[in-house]
Structures are given as structure tokens and as C-alpha cells.
């Protein structure tokens, strides 16, 4: 039985030219971490795979750094990167649990973080 | 179009070292990672491990650790495969490959540097 | 380590078969599963990842299916190219891993 639960960082806006840390956090279970896969929408970002490193898709390695821890740095932001992020956890013995971040990039200086909050997971079995 | 050219075909004493370089040409070289595969006479292809070029850090098979060391010179587009203390068993094909856009799997390989390990 | 098996070892085929090649993982890696083909003296080329994609430049009669621990890759119907050793190889963990090839010829 999954137990876990996805921890995200929420709602979250920023400016234009700015950057974010993109962020979850896996807690409620023991299961081991494997992989974290980033993605926008439907387009991989980036991987984290405990025993191999850090993937970054070549279309963002200019402007995606990897961490803090399993998080991700979003750097350089375009009004383009407002939308939805998802983290991917694969787990053992678990499967995976998907948080969802909703990131919006503003014009002006009124760009403020929204509240940590925590999501419904989803996840399916393997 | 892109291309990962190898240097020649090594002949090579038990116990001595062996680099292959592995030059990219046709995409930008640090935006992806680089993978080293190395293929004995008709085995299974084995990983050795992989290197981000634009910071350098690698990652490595468990069994090659102690004697595999990867580099990369960026200004040269060229990543670098050395083995140390090298015996019989290292007789084999080495392949230099491109890390795909997706994971780690690897999309344009080079063609391969044969490297002989006799007395 | 992640180990990966493969059947048929070997198959003999005609042009315009259908080929199916079977790759069995130790251990669920989810869809990180790709497949190479490689014709003698030649380098490895790249036919799936994902355990479904197919790569750029792959004629449309190759596919990939499964995921978790079974995988299959299928030649809808042969032509006398795809005649080589294929290689199925997980993309999930360290080290990376291959299988020991699947060796499609002539009948």
C-alpha cells in the first residue's frame, strides 16, 4: 500500500528575468527514492537518478541548474515558463507519486511566493 | 550533422594505461553528457560510465572505478577515456556515445577504437 | 546490478516477416528501456528509447512495447537492412546495462 505523500512548493510566481527553485518533498513513507523526473507540461526538464546523477535536457541546460537536493533551479524566466511543473518520484518498493507545482511569470515586481501547501498525490503502481 | 570521431586502434602491454580521445563536431558539446561503452569480441556491450562536459562531473561503472578516469576539453569539443593497469580481459572495441535528450541512453555513437591488450 | 536477458539468442528470418524480440529485466525500471541495432564491425545505432520511442531517422516497421520488467521489440515486417544483433539495454540505474543480443538472419 502507498502510503506517501508529495510535498510542493504550490503556487508559486516570479519575475521575468528571475529565477525559481522548483521544489518537493516525498515524507509518510520508507520507500527508497530511485529517480526524480522533472517535466513542463508534457516536456522533460530534468532527471535526478540516485545512482547516476543528474540528467538536464540539452533544450534547457543553458538555463536549468540541478538542486537544491532533488529540487530544480529555473533560471533566466520568460512570461513562456508560466504553467504547470510536475514531479515525478519513482520509489521502491512504492511506484510513483506525481506532485504538480503551478508556476506564473510576471512582468512587473509584484512576483511573491505562494504558501507551501500539500497536494493530493497521484500515483500508480508498476 | 552531428559526428563523434575516435582516435586509431591502440596495441598495448599488460599493466600499462590506454586513452581514447572521442571528438564531437555538429551539435553544441556541453550541453550534452557523454557516455564511454566498451564491447570485447563477440560479448555484450558494458557501460563504463558517462560525463556532464560542462562541469566535468562523472559518474562511473563500479567495476571499472579504480581505473577508468573520464575528462573532457571543452575548447577542444573532445571527451577522453582513460584505463589503467590494463590486462588481457580489456581487449576490446570502446565506443565514445552521446547521451539522448530524454535520459541515458546515448543516440550518435562513435565509431570505435580498438585497443589490444598483448605481450 | 540490473541484469537483462534476451530471446531468441538468435533467429532466422525472410524479407517481409514479422520479428518479435523478447528482453526480460531483474527488476522493474518502469519504461527506461531502449534498443540498438548493430551490423558486424559497425557501431551501435539507436531504435527506441522509453521502451516506445521511436528514434529520429527509424523506419516507421520497428516498435517497442512494455514496461516494468518485460519488453518486446517487433519488426513488423523484415527488410534485408535490418538483417544484424539486437541489443536491448535498461537506461534506469548504475551501471547502465545491455543484453546479450539477439542475432536476427537470413533463412
Known amino acids: 500500500m502507498m502510503t506517501g505523500t508529495i510535498e510542493t512548493t504550490g503556487n508559486i510566481s516570479a519575475e521575468k528575468g528571475g529565477s525559481i527553485i522548483l521544489q518537493c518533498h516525498l515524507s509518510s513513507t520508507t520507500a527508497q527514492v530511485t529517480q526524480v523526473n522533472w517535466e513542463q507540461q508534457d516536456q522533460l526538464l530534468a532527471i535526478c537518478n540516485a545512482d547516476l546523477g543528474w540528467h538536464i535536457s540539452p533544450s534547457f541546460k543553458d538555463r536549468v541548474a540541478p538542486g537544491p537536493g532533488l529540487g530544480l533551479t529555473l533560471q533566466s524566466l520568460t512570461v513562456n515558463d508560466t504553467g504547470e511543473y510536475f514531479c515525478i518520484y519513482h520509489t521502491y518498493p512504492d511506484g510513483t507519486y506525481t506532485g504538480r507545482i503551478f508556476l506564473e511569470v510576471l512582468e512587473s515586481s509584484v512576483a511573491e511566493h505562494g504558501a507551501r501547501f500539500q497536494i493530493p498525490h497521484h500515483h500508480h503502481h508498476h | 550533422e552531428v559526428q563523434l570521431v575516435q582516435s586509431g586502434a591502440e596495441v598495448k602491454k599488460p599493466g600499462a594505461s590506454v586513452k581514447v580521445s572521442c571528438k564531437a563536431s555538429g551539435y553544441t558539446f556541453t550541453n550534452y553528457y557523454m557516455h564511454w561503452v566498451r564491447q570485447a569480441p563477440g560479448q555484450r556491450l558494458e557501460w563504463m560510465g558517462r560525463i556532464d562536459p560542462d562541469s566535468g562531473g562523472s559518474k562511473y561503472n563500479e567495476k571499472f572505478k579504480s581505473r577508468v578516469t573520464i575528462t573532457v576539453d571543452k575548447s577542444a569539443s573532445t571527451a577522453y577515456m582513460e584505463l589503467s593497469s590494463l590486462r588481457s580481459e580489456d581487449t576490446a572495441v570502446y565506443y565514445c556515445?552521446?547521451?539522448?535528450?530524454?535520459?541515458?541512453?546515448?543516440?550518435?555513437w562513435g565509431q570505435g577504437t580498438t585497443v589490444t591488450v598483448s605481450s | 546490478d540490473i541484469q537483462m536477458t534476451q530471446s531468441p539468442s538468435s533467429l532466422s528470418a525472410s524479407v517481409g516477416d514479422r520479428v518479435t524480440i523478447t528482453c526480460r529485466v531483474s527488476?522493474?525500471?518502469?519504461?527506461?528501456l531502449a534498443w540498438y541495432q548493430q551490423k558486424p564491425g559497425k557501431s551501435p545505432k539507436l531504435l527506441i528509447y522509453?521502451?516506445?520511442t521511436l528514434a529520429e531517422g527509424v523506419p516507421s516497421r520497428f516498435s517497442g512495447s512494455g514496461s516494468g520488467t518485460d519488453f518486446t521489440l517487433t519488426i513488423s515486417s523484415l527488410q534485408p537492412e535490418d538483417f544484424a544483433t539486437y541489443y536491448c539495454?535498461?537506461?534506469?540505474?548504475?551501471?547502465?546495462?545491455f543484453g546479450p543480443g539477439t542475432k536476427v538472419d537470413i533463412k
Open positions: 527488476e522493474n525500471i518502469y519504461s527506461y
Open positions: 522509453n521502451a516506445k
Open positions: 539495454q535498461h537506461h534506469y540505474g548504475n551501471p547502465l546495462t
Open positions: 556515445a552521446r547521451e539522448g535528450h530524454y535520459g541515458f541512453y546515448s543516440d550518435y
